[in-house]
Amino acid sequence: TQNKALPENIKYGIVLDAGSSHTSLYIYKWPAEKENDTGVVHQVEECRVKGPGISKYVQKVNEIGIYLTDCMERAREVIPRSQHQETPVYLGATAGMRLLRMESEELADRVLDVVERSLSNYPFDFQGARIITGQEEGAYGWITINYLLGKFSQKTRWFSIVPYETNNQETFGALDLGGASTQITFVPQNQTTESPDNALQFRLYGKDYNVYTHSFLCYGKDQALWQKLAKDIQVASNEILRDPCFHPGYKKVVNVSDLYKTPCTKRFEMTLPFQQFEIQGIGNYQQCHQSVLELFNTSYCPYSQCAFNGIFLPPLQGDFGAFSAFYFVMNFLNLTSEKVSQEKVTEMMKKFCSQPWEEIKTSYAGVKEKYLSEYCFSGTYILSLLLQGYHFTADSWEHIHFIGKIQGSDAGWTLGYMLNLTNMIPAEQPLSTPLSHSTYV
């Protein structure tokens, strides 16, 4: 594709999602003459950068350039050379970098500075690297899924793009789970909000939206696990932690220094009489669930209703798309089907967690062990977060749709971010040009 003439005027955009556990590069394309239409932008490539998230490069910033090379070279390959100079590149860093910034603004700035210098060396139109806020992450995720589901379009279609799409224009709520934070974003029934911090107003395609959003820092699946370990080791009698969230027979040595490295475990930090401890899995869903619930403070709420930790949460409304790690984990566990009830999910989790580690390794040969070992915890955490954290019930569970992709594009904040920064979501409904919405004639 490198130098072939394009049959129509196609534009491209690149967004790098610098997450806490890894970085992914997304390439989007759209027909230039339709860039204000809804649903015309789609993802053509995802490239996962090898290695950890950029915040882990704080002590080796000189390696950041080489770290990004493979995926940036892939972008150079996928996007026609004639388009390189006009292709915008954006990098948004999320909770991993928010945590680093909490520890040291100077170190976070240094990492971003090196990232910017590295990305400026490519022939694209680099537009900057920044740490996006939790509110932005929630809002852009909400925009992405509703854009892809066609919820902003004023035209009713006689066909359905995806199985759970209805022809009504009610937007979907967005549930996003990362490694270091989790976001919940939706349009509540009641337009007035008790917490202005959680309120966003948008005008998109001629319609006003009053949106609730909150990002829970330290409640992504990886940081939640660190929190749980730090909490549980406080009461361990020796350097062995019998952990119900890992399979029977699983063993792993953890350095106490690694445990207390993150700001997320500060509230549990104490002087321990050992430098290392060993996790020994006992695989008990019920006990794991109980341990996870202790991470959510539900005893204090200064509003009419809260999620946890005193954060306002209005009554849940409508359907929700649950993506990123919500999807990856539930998909691995084979629990994404609309037909699987919450009770069935709990039952399956009990069974899964109790399976011996050696059996799990054999059954799932080829699944990376680091991830494989944590699915029991992650699945339990997801259930706890959705049910006790966000107050979904057995009945409202059926309103949660676990989504990986919508029409070939990953659900996540990156598309919404690019649409916003390239001004591709107009406030007003664009005037329809002749034939622009018709099928081919």
Epitope: D70, R74, K370
Partner: antibody, heavy 123, light 107 residues
Framework: QVQLKETGPGLVQPTQTLSITCTVS????????TQWVRQTPGKGLEWMGF???????QYNSAFKSRLSISRDTSKNQVFLKMNSLKTEDTGVYYC?????????????????WGQGASVTVSS | DIRMTQSPASLSASLGETVNIECLAS??????LAWYQKKPGKSPQLLIY???ALQNGVPSRFSGSGSGTHFSLKINSLQSEDVATYFC?????????FGGGTKLELR
């Protein structure tokens, strides 16, 4: 079926330049990376560098100043050139295929290797 | 550079025995580790990638495990054709690096 075949000079004088050609069949150079690895008596297996499907290169900094990798896609050939040879460069030079999985972030796995080109650096 | 240390450097085992080879990385490499088998005069063959994924066509008696810094290659029920040198390789960071090899022979 997938094959890679290295052809080299066998004997090279010290200070001279080594040139090896890797001819591939059964796959396209524009879909795979082509890696170079050598095995020397002193250092065992050493990764040297590679050329990506798009044509850009990555080198091991231990060789960077004297190594260059290029290709001719019309002939299905990849070329390794290394100058300023020393006796320690004596060994077997392999080209190998690397199937990049961008979605998974897996690249650097050498799934098919050539039979190797034996190189002796001696005067 | 990431150092890959293999142990033992050599070992002898009897037919039908189970063999374990260890590979230790000098820093966390996640699961970005491959195992290769090399017979004298032949080119290396890929056995395992991503720490534990079996390459197509490789007998199921070979298995890999581990993540982070500790990895192992296990050969169940050793066969005569398994006599070879085994190498591990990390591919998380440039330069990619190999272990020094483990020479396996029959007792």
């Amino acid at each position: 079926q997938v094959q890679l075949k290295e052809t080299g000079p066998g004997l090279v004088q010290p200070t001279q330049t080594l040139s090896i050609t890797c001819t591939v069949s059964g796959f396209s150079l524009t879909s795979y990376f082509t890696q170079w690895v050598r095995q020397t008596p002193g250092k065992g297996l050493e990764w040297m560098g590679f050329i990506r499907s798009g044509g850009s290169t990555q080198y091991n900094s231990a060789f960077k100043s004297r190594l260059s990798i290029s290709r001719d896609t019309s002939k299905n050939q990849v070329f390794l050139k290394m100058n300023s040879l020393k006796t320690e460069d004596t060994g077997v030079y392999y080209c190998a295929r690397d199937r990049p999985d961008y979605h998974d972030g897996t690249y650097g796995v050498l799934d098919v290797w050539g039979q190797g080109a034996s190189v002796t650096v001696s005067s | 550079d990431i150092r890959m240390t293999q142990s033992p450097a050599s070992l002898s085992a009897s037919l039908g025995e189970t063999v374990n080879i260890e590979c230790l990385a000098s820093e966390d490499i996640d699961s970005d580790l491959a195992w290769y088998q090399k017979k004298p005069g032949k080119s290396p063959q890929l056995l395992i990638y991503n720490g534990n994924a079996l390459q197509n066509g490789v007998p199921s008696r070979f298995s890999g495990s581990g993540s982070g810094t500790h990895f192992s290659l296990k050969i169940n029920s050793l066969q005569s054709e398994d006599v070879a040198t085994y190498f591990c390789q990390q591919y998380i960071n440039y330069p990619y690096t190999f272990g020094g090899g483990t020479k396996l022979e029959l007792r």
